[in-house]
């Protein structure tokens, strides 16, 4: 979030002093509340970061993102026969990063015509409720479905009504405590205009009373609460889940399990790379240097880590992908532009034609042939 | 001290053009926004120009716009003033001023001597 | 665009005496309003910037006040050299306008 300085402060700020704070006086006339931009706020607003490099990152996630999780979502719902509680998770990721990416085409006009918001204070509202909403749901179906992924190998037990019953209940919880976190950002006003530059901002410019003590107990807790101890558990699921598959015998089938694991666990841990920790971190940091210093060194990376945070939605495909073999299907078969009817009746033709071979080749032969399809 | 020295005025016939100079000291030049303000003979003031502190973007009058053109050298903490099919309506003193962006607005808090442009035939 | 009436056109006041120039802006322009004083043969000096905030190195007597679209300048303590005219300038609304001044004398 830009702030601008005050007369008093020194260097290059990015507060956005209030000056007149907003309240009804007893006359019942409202005065309004003044939010500071200074010349480097301006040029951050105007310049290349937030006019260029995030419209280009935004337009990648939204091309990427809205088919493949439109396509996992389909596939969860209604090509997926067991509703595994992997299942569960992956098509609440898949529909968290939906909510998301739906409204991107706003946030790139945004950013492309000088960072001005035409669209009203609710859909701006909404926009940033969803995108902070996205990222920790994000975390926290991820961390389900690592902890389940975890499990399933512990203890491979087949798919149970039961089971499917908790993971959605888990997902309920999960929405309705996302709703919950991340309330202040609907309540709090977030668009600013900004009569020098002609444009009214989007969760860019922020009051400063608001700021520097709120924003940064706020995103610390969410910060501790919804990204550190997730993290740990997942990385606690994936630590446990290695060891697991190193002990395990080794077989042609469990090869390929682990292999599929090993590249789960690390695209997971891309996303917490490049996605989640640092936009964690620097909210925390940008905030807290607010709070102390009175200006943040630190905003253009944090405005890069906001807008790589958004990259998950991208990553998510690739983790269903390792996942869930439904998905992997429909996957390979939408990059070759195949129906999966198609694709099942090749096998099944293919399939007989190998078993019609294979018994001819039974009776002439005495040794035992272990067959894999 | 902040000092702005205007420069380019004079006369010009109609439809001809003229840039206008204005050199800054005394301040951060690549830091600051940068404006012209003019004043015919006997008259009000009228805004005309603004360039922001990158360059990255100008404002003008729907009277100038098209004409007019405002730019910025800040290796030479330099002001310009392109000014193209000139009209007699134009004749004014033109001021350079230095504009603070304070609680989201531009205030002119300094102001140079001004240059006189007369356009006549 | 945004009209900026000022009022009176122009007024004289003894030394000491308090004085006050009224500005209407067309329609609300939420504080973003600054003063300027003209003496003659020089160069505008900025007042007041966002309605009632004082520029460094001006006189305290100088005051301004309003919201909405009716702002005020008020000088407290009438000085020779407070002479000259005043002008008052909308910056929330491109283009940026500015009134028609009000010269003040000293009576």
């Known amino acids: 979030t830009i702030q601008g300085t005050n007369r008093s402060s020194k260097g290059r700020s990015l507060i956005g002093k209030v000056d007149g704070t907003s309240h009804v006086t007893g006359k019942g006339v409202t005065v309004e509340t003044v939010f500071s931009v200074d010349e480097f706020s301006a040029s951050v607003l105007t310049g290349k970061l937030t006019t260029v490099f995030l419209p280009i990152v935004y337009t990648i996630v939204f091309v990427v993102g809205l088919p493949s999780n439109g396509m996992a979502l389909w596939v969860f719902l209604f090509r997926t026969k067991k509703k595994h509680p992997a299942v569960i998770y992956m098509a609440n990721l898949a529909l968290a990063d939906l909510l998301s990416v739906i409204w991107f085409p706003l946030k790139i006009a945004y950013h492309i015509h000088g960072n001005n918001w035409i669209y009203g204070e609710a859909l701006c509202n909404v926009l940033i409720g969803f995108f902070y909403g996205n990222m920790y749901c994000s975390i926290l179906f991820m961390t389900c479905l690592s902890v389940q992924r975890y499990w399933v190998i512990v203890n491979p037990m087949g798919h149970s009504r039961k089971k499917a019953n908790i993971a959605i209940g888990i997902s309920l919880a999960i929405w309705l405590l996302i709703l919950l976190v991340t309330i202040p950002l609907y309540v709090v006003k977030q668009t600013i205009f900004i009569p020098a530059l002609n444009i009214t901002t989007c969760h860019d410019v922020l009051p400063e009373q608001l700021l520097v003590g709120d924003m940064f107990n706020y995103f610390l807790s969410l910060a501790i609460g919804v990204f550190l101890f997730p993290a740990f558990l997942t990385a606690s699921a994936y630590v446990l889940m290695i060891r697991m598959l190193r002990s395990s015998a080794m077989d042609e089938n469990s090869e390929k399990k682990r292999k599929r694991a090993i590249k789960l666990i690390v695209t997971v841990l891309a996303m917490y790379l490049i996605c989640f920790t640092p936009s964690n971190l620097l909210l925390v940091v940008h905030y807290f240097l607010i709070k102390s210093q009175g200006q943040s060194h630190v905003y253009a990376l944090y405005i890069v880590a906001l807008c790589l945070s958004t990259l998950n939605s991208c990553i998510d495909p690739f983790v269903y992908y390792f996942v869930s073999h439904d998905f992997r299907d429909h996957a390979k078969n939408a990059l070759l532009c195949r129906s999966v009817r198609t694709v099942k009746q090749m096998q099944v033709s293919l399939t007989s034609k190998k078993h019609s071979r294979k018994s001819s080749s039974y009776s002439s032969s005495s040794t035992t042939v272990k067959t894999s399809y | 001290e902040v000092q702005l020295v205007e420069s380019g005025g004079g006369l010009v016939q109609p439809g001809r053009s003229l840039k206008l100079s204005c050199v800054a000291s005394?301040?951060?030049?690549?830091?600051?926004?940068m404006t012209w303000i003019r004043q015919a003979p006997g008259k009000g003031l009228e805004w005309i120009a603004s360039?922001?502190?990158?360059?990255?973007?100008?404002f003008y009058p729907d009277s100038v716009k098209g004409r007019f053109t405002i730019s910025r050298d800040d290796a030479k903490s330099t002001l310009y003033l392109q000014m193209n099919s000139l009209r007699s309506e134009d004749t004014a003193t033109y001021y350079c001023t230095r504009a603070t962006i304070r609680r989201g607005a531009s205030y002119f808090d300094y102001w140079g001597q001004g240059v006189m442009v007369t356009v006549s035939s | 665009d945004i009209q900026m009436t000022q009022s009176p056109h122009s007024l004289s006041a003894s030394l000491g005496e308090g004085v006050s120039i009224e500005c209407l802006a067309s329609?609300?322009?939420?504080?973003?309003l600054a003063w300027f004083q003209q003496k003659p043969g020089k160069s505008p000096q900025l007042l007041i910037y966002y309605a009632s905030s004082l520029q460094d190195g001006v006189p305290s007597r100088f005051s301004g006040s309003g919201s909405g679209t009716q702002y005020s300048l008020k000088i407290s303590n009438m000085q020779p050299e407070d002479e000259g005219v005043y002008y008052c300038?909308?910056?929330?609304?491109?283009?940026?306008?500015f009134g028609g001044g009000t010269k003040l004398e000293l009576k």
């Open positions: 360039i922001t502190n990158t360059g990255g973007r100008t």
């Open positions: 300038q909308q910056g929330y609304k491109y283009p940026w306008t």
């Open positions: 005394g301040f951060t030049f690549n830091n600051k926004w």
């Open positions: 329609e609300g322009i939420s504080n973003y």
